[in-house]
């Protein structure tokens, strides 16, 4: 009669994260009597993972009933497996002994490797903004996947980038790993519709890779260009200025209006109008009494945008021209929200 | 103190039905396994049947398999052996045995390779 | 089948050998059960090759290597005059049993 072998027939099982890991292991005698155990790794530290003498193991379920007497097949299955799960799983048996049962011989183990998907990949931005031509870096980062292998791309607008670097962690043996690049991007005035992807493919996910985005709206600036215009006289003594604010973005703008130096009012962009690549445009307009005035009047167009140092226009009014007429104190009317009348 | 003790013996004819019955004490029942080995006058020791802890895994000697029933009752503490058709052959005395091994799951099967303790034994003698 | 000598004698204080032999190495327990007369209770005297029960004289050991086993009494005496039946399974035979040795001390 020969001894007893433990015959584990497979050296490798892949199993998917959540679903049910089979371990299969028989024994080829009914002796000597004593309990199978089955551990994961070797020597002192192993784990046990089911002891069919005694125990609570809630994940592992048994492959044949091992009530039956001739039973040698000592199969487990282990549910919910997760990248944790992973490592060599060995089938031990052990005969009856006093007053401990005695470690009798162990299968050659089964190695279980577990598939985990990416997490979502997560791609973040600078945490402030950038105006056209500068480079910007993006990071994206997923977690949680196994085995190591995985492909990263970066796209803009569905332009892949090059310009990138990626790393995935840790570099020796792990139960799972986690990818982080980064990638450089160069900002154009035409950016505010723009998407920085970032790809991530894997054999879990049975080539529909996962995708995290970033709208460059929330990191581009797109500072203003100013224009200041001098309207034609739309009544007798009246002319209309202008100040053109044009491609900017975001939204956030405060304009103000200086006669000679001095601040004669101040709003905020409110009523704007969008252009197609997403920058706005925005005028304001000053109706100018010029028979208030003896002297030329220099008009400035003042704009914070963003929060960033101001920039402005001046627009120089000539008023020589212009009759004036004597002892008029008359005050000008106020026509409209953008109009300002200048004594 | 673990003691075994059996009952049911005597003169029996053959063709009958025997039935023997070993009460156990000091000790569970249910987690050893329990067998019968019978010697025959000038013989050596003779396995006859026998019973795992989990109670349903059972085994039989050649001598005796198709009419020997052993079974058990652990609220009894008791573990009978039912033989039909009783021969001549059968004529010796019945020990009742229990293992060593505390066994508390099923593949213990029904084992009786360490025997730790013997009951006295119940004579049984076929003749007609 | 085990095999085992018929018979063995010994002058007390002599140490006594009983070998069991399994005709494979798959008897992987023995137990060693004294027999003072035909028909009255055996008593395990060495079970798990080596493990003495309580009650049991130091004197009575036993050891197993491959597919044999040896009972040994050290320093015999005259009340361990008895028949020595060696006990073990294989996959088939939950219970096996040796013909049994009968020890004689001179």
């Known amino acids: 009669e020969e001894e007893l072998q433990v015959i584990q027939p497979d050296k490798s099982v892949l199993v998917a994260a959540g679903e049910t890991a089979t371990l299969r292991c028989t024994a080829t005698s009914l002796i000597p009597v004593g309990p199978i155990q089955w551990f994961r790794g070797a020597g002192p530290g192993r784990e046990l993972i089911y002891n069919q003498k005694e125990g609570h193991f809630p994940r592992v379920t048994t492959v044949s009933d091992l009530t039956k007497r001739n039973n040698m097949d000592f199969s487990i299955r282990i549910g919910n497996i997760t990248p944790a799960d992973a490592g060599t799983y060995y089938c031990v048996k052990f005969r009856k002994g006093s007053p401990d049962d005695v470690e009798f011989k162990s299968g050659a183990g089964t190695e279980l490797s577990v598939r985990a998907k990416p997490s979502a990949p997560v791609v973040s931005g600078p945490a402030a903004r950038a105006t056209p031509q500068h480079t910007v870096s993006f990071t994206c980062e997923s977690h949680g996947f196994s085995p190591r292998d995985i492909t990263l791309k970066w796209f803009k607008n569905g332009n892949e980038l090059s310009d990138f670097q990626t790393n995935v962690d840790p570099v020796g043996e792990s139960v799972s790993y986690s990818i982080h690049s980064t990638a450089k991007v160069v900002l154009t005035r035409e950016d505010v519709h723009s998407q920085v992807i970032c790809e991530v493919a894997h054999v879990t996910l049975q080539g529909d890779p996962l995708r995290g985005t970033a709208n460059l709206s929330e990191t581009i600036r797109v500072p203003p260009t100013l224009e200041v215009t001098q309207q034609p006289v739309r009544a007798e003594n009246q002319v209309n200025v202008t100040c053109q604010v044009r491609k900017f973005y975001p939204q956030r703008l405060q304009l103000t209006w200086l006669e000679n130096g001095n601040v004669s009012r101040t709003e905020t962009a409110s009523t704007v109008t969008e252009n197609k690549d997403g920058t706005y445009n925005w005028m304001s307009w000053l109706l100018v009494n010029v028979s208030a005035h003896r002297d030329d009047v220099k008009l400035t167009c003042q704009v914070e945008h963003d929060g960033q140092p101001a920039v402005s226009k001046s627009h120089d009014l000539k008023v020589s021209a212009h009759p004036k007429e004597q002892g008029s104190n008359t005050a000008a009317e106020n026509t409209g929200s953008n109009e300002r009348n200048i004594y | 103190a673990v003691t075994l003790d059996e009952s049911g013996g005597g003169l029996q004819t053959p063709g009958r039905a025997l039935s023997l019955v070993c009460r156990g004490s000091g000790f569970s029942i249910s987690s050893y396994n329990m067998g019968w080995v019978r010697q025959a006058p000038g013989k050596g020791l003779e396995f006859i049947a026998s019973i795992g802890s989990d109670g349903s895994s059972t085994h039989y000697a050649p001598a005796v398999k198709g009419r020997a029933t052993i079974t058990r009752d652990v609220g009894q503490s008791t573990v009978r052996l039912q033989l039909n058709n009783l021969r001549a052959e059968d004529t010796g005395t019945y020990f009742c045995a229990k293992d060593a091994y505390q066994c508390s799951y099923a593949t213990c099967n029904d084992y009786l390779d360490t025997i730790d303790a013997w009951g006295h034994g119940t004579e049984v003698i076929v003749s007609s | 089948a085990l095999t085992q000598p018929s018979s063995v004698s010994a002058n007390p204080g002599e140490t006594v050998k009983i070998t069991c032999s399994g005709d494979n190495s798959a008897h992987y327990y023995y137990g060693w059960y004294q027999q003072k007369s035909p028909g009255s209770a055996p008593v395990t005297v060495i079970y798990y090759n080596d493990k003495r029960p309580s009650g049991i004289p130091s004197r009575f050991s036993g050891s197993a290597s491959g597919s044999t086993a040896t009972l040994i009494i050290t320093g015999v005496q005259v009340e361990d005059e008895a028949v020595y039946f060696c006990?073990?399974?294989?996959?088939?035979?939950?219970?096996?049993f040796g013909a049994g040795t009968t020890l004689t001390v001179l």
């Open positions: 006990g073990s399974a294989d996959s088939s035979n939950p219970a096996i």
